[in-house]
Amino acid sequence: QEEDLPRPSISAEPGTVIPLGSHVTFVCRGPVGVQTFRLERESRSTYNDTEDVSQASPSESEARFRIDSVSEGNAGPYRCIYYKPPKWSEQSDYLELLVKETSGGPDSPDTEPGSSAGPTQRPSDNSHNEHAPASQGLKAEHLYHHHHHH
């Protein structure tokens, strides 16, 4: 039987409360051997895939998704999943991105990702590896910044 894949984690740098117009980077982490990380938003069909996966530690890989200039439209819950042939992982917990006016008060503390969001059904998939659908070279800002689409 195939080994279960550990759930990914998600975090945000420099934090989850971001001033309007500033940048944020989502960091997805999983085990070594991940081929594709995917960043998703709740209740949406749009996503951003990357195969630019680096080794964060001897037992962990990561991918980074940067939004250069956040708008109100970027606020909301984000999560990661990953593909380690031949299986997809479960989804990470949701991480809520808050966008604040630049004239606002002091920064809120960073939100750390939770450890578990409960079990998710796993695929019974023994398929061969396939190339992921083409990402068309789009940046996360284009995918998630649609209120000020370039």
Partner: antibody, heavy 117, light 110 residues
Framework: EQSLESGGGLITPGGTLTLTCTAS????????MNWVRQAPGKGLEWIGY?????KTYYANWAKGRFTISKTSTTVDLKMTSLTAEDTGTYFC??????????????WGPGTLVTISS | ELVLTQTPASVSEPVGGTVTIKCQAS??????LAWYQQKPGQPPKLLIY???RLASGVSSRFGGSGSGTEFTLTISDLECADAATYYC????????????FGGGTEVVVK
Amino acid sequence: EQSLESGGGLITPGGTLTLTCTASGFTVTRYYMNWVRQAPGKGLEWIGYIYASSKTYYANWAKGRFTISKTSTTVDLKMTSLTAEDTGTYFCARGGVGNSGLNLDLWGPGTLVTISS
Amino acid sequence: ELVLTQTPASVSEPVGGTVTIKCQASQSIGSWLAWYQQKPGQPPKLLIYQASRLASGVSSRFGGSGSGTEFTLTISDLECADAATYYCQQAEYSGDVENTFGGGTEVVVK
């Protein structure tokens, strides 16, 4: 690459029917696999999709009565409490091009479901 | 909930002419809109995605534009083979939707 729906036919009101979409040339777990239906002479109606770790989304009207599941090569649509309004052609369509699971670039020919007593 | 309104319901133009179909979203969807062509007895065919990107193998006579809530499909230099029903589809939201497709526009080529 292609997909083919099967399992359609004539069924009585109140019954349950499961349609199957069989993929060839690609692996369904790497894509968003959608079900779309079309009543005779009417427009397209999205039912829902499944992807990744069997994550599903459904149209509001389909929740509870329709269930999508999958294996590595097939995607099933289970329909319960069928009525005459469920009569139509049911399509299986692959999504994922252009970074959206709702961009449907590969469609099966469809299978006809008729609900009648 | 997000609703797509397609106009007109039907349009008739001569060979060589131009057809413009509009799709209005009840809330902003950025550029997450696709267009499909469907001929009788056939499944739909993806023409355009992300509002203006041409799908593989689709003629450049088809063009898409718009963002936010207003979108347009333009078919230029009409051919008899373009006679079909055209549907827009929002490609962003999968939660709290009744349908992702617009109502369709029948194109008749005279």
